[in-house]
């Protein structure tokens, strides 16, 4: 079955936007005016995952690019990366677990928990211009809350 997808942008709770930083990394920084066009547009796909009352499994691809956010172990630590895929086969309903995030939505604030590594979340730093990463703490210094803006397809 074709997977259902929506185009969107994400901003962290400090209103930092996400932009490309090199070919395989995202960073978060404040953008204004025309610079807003730099922010990445995600294709959020609704995929199969664990049954849960408050978690919706999604995959986050970069619109019109064959890149997906994925979670892998690097030096024994859960790590966020942009992974290149074969566009003929992606997105798909049954995404490999490393590509799946549990979208948790409370009062229009979103968290993205790694399905592969429970309690690890897509995170940004308080500081400007730092990489988007996978963080193992919630409610600390690092930011794990995002807002979503729909983008016309």
């Amino acid at each position: 079955a074709p997977v259902r997808s929506l185009n969107c942008t994400l901003r962290d709770s400090q209103q930092k936007s996400l932009v490309m930083s090199g070919p395989y990394e995202l960073k978060a920084l404040h953008l204004q005016g025309q610079d807003m066009e730099q922010q990445v547009v995600f294709s959020m796909s609704f995929v199969q995952g664990e049954e849960s009352n408050d978690k919706i499994p999604v995959a986050l691809g970069l619109k019109e690019k064959n890149l997906y956010l994925s979670c892998v172990l690097k030096d024994d630590k859960p790590t966020l990366q942009l992974e290149s895929v074969d566009p003929k086969n992606y997105p798909k309903k049954k995404m490999e677990k490393r590509f799946v995030f549990n979208k948790i939505e409370i009062n229009n604030k979103l968290e993205f928990e790694s399905a592969q590594f429970p309690n690890w979340y897509i995170s940004t730093s308080q500081a400007e211009n730092m990489p988007v990463f996978l963080g193992g703490t919630k409610g600390g210094q690092d930011i794990t809350d995002f807002t979503m803006q729909f983008v016309s397809s």
């Epitope: 259902r4 929506l6 049954e51 309903k93 939505e105 729909f150 016309s152 397809s153």
Partner: antibody, heavy 120, light 107 residues
Framework: QVQLVQSGAEVKKPGASVKVSCKVS????????IEWVRQAPGKGLEWIGE????????NYNEKFKGKATITADTSTDTAYMELSSLRSEDTAVYYC?????????????WGQGTLVTVSS | DIQMTQSPSSLSASVGDRVTITCKAS??????LSWFQQKPGKAPKSLIY???RLVDGVPSRFSGSASGTDYTLTISSLQPEDFATYYC?????????FGQGTKLEIK
């Protein structure tokens, strides 16, 4: 509370068009799909299509492509469905309903329905 | 298209009875299944979504379950207001498809 209020009943001649409206209140219009469903007299429910007003995404049942055109006006929180080239078999009650953008919650809220009668 | 085969098409029961209505999907629908109640001249009313989650305000006598591609709506103890027509809906794949309906009548 959430409300979906549809336009009133219509009587149309074969070959004419009709535009049914669905005005929503009580939630953020752009974050919910608006679904359109029809029910012919004495029959079951049939899905026509859906629109996500915040994005302009539209999905149709192939059966209704060319028959139904779904639009939305985010300035008035109103969705529309226009039916063209009406025939007697298009006589039905047309309902709008809603589902959250991530599809999780099902068709939770429904309009009261709009009866469209096609008769010469 | 995914076919939703609903059974029985009609059912006679008494107040206090336990009744079950089944929908069989022609393929996997990843638990994207809802149940609706409709009374004559009224819009459908949502009862259950994602197989077993009760819509706010729906009495706990209604429940849903799944086994493979078979989905069941159970009313544990029928009340007079429960006599109506019930529909299932799959919303996993386009076009979304409804079951043919089950008319629940008073015996």
């Amino acid at each position: 509370q959430v409300q979906l209020v549809q336009s009133g009943a219509e009587v149309k001649k074969p070959g004419a068009s009709v535009k049914v409206s669905c005005k929503v209140s009580g939630y953020t219009f752009s974050r919910y799909w608006i679904e359109w469903v029809r029910q012919a007299p004495g029959k079951g429910l049939e899905w026509i299509g859906e629109i996500l007003p915040g994005q302009g995404n539209i999905n149709y049942n192939e059966k209704f492509k060319g028959k139904a055109t779904i639009t939305a006006d985010t300035s008035t929180d109103t969705a529309y469905m226009e039916l063209s080239s009406l025939r007697s078999e298009d006589t039905a009650v047309y309902y709008c309903s809603t589902i959250y953008y991530d599809y999780d919650q099902g068709f939770t809220y429904w309009g009261q329905g709009t009866l469209v009668t096609v008769s010469s | 298209d995914i076919q939703m085969t609903q059974s029985p098409s009609s059912l006679s029961a008494s107040v206090g009875d336990r009744v079950t209505i089944t929908c069989k999907a022609s393929q996997d629908i990843d638990r994207y299944l809802s149940w609706f109640q409709q009374k004559p001249g009224k819009a459908p009313k949502s009862l259950i979504y994602r197989v077993k989650r009760l819509v706010d305000g729906v009495p706990s006598r209604f429940s849903g379950s799944a086994s493979g591609t078979d989905y069941t709506l159970t009313i544990s103890s029928l009340q007079p207001e429960d006599f109506a027509t019930y529909y299932c809906l799959q919303y996993d794949e386009f076009p979304y498809t409804f079951g043919q309906g089950t008319k629940l009548e008073i015996k």
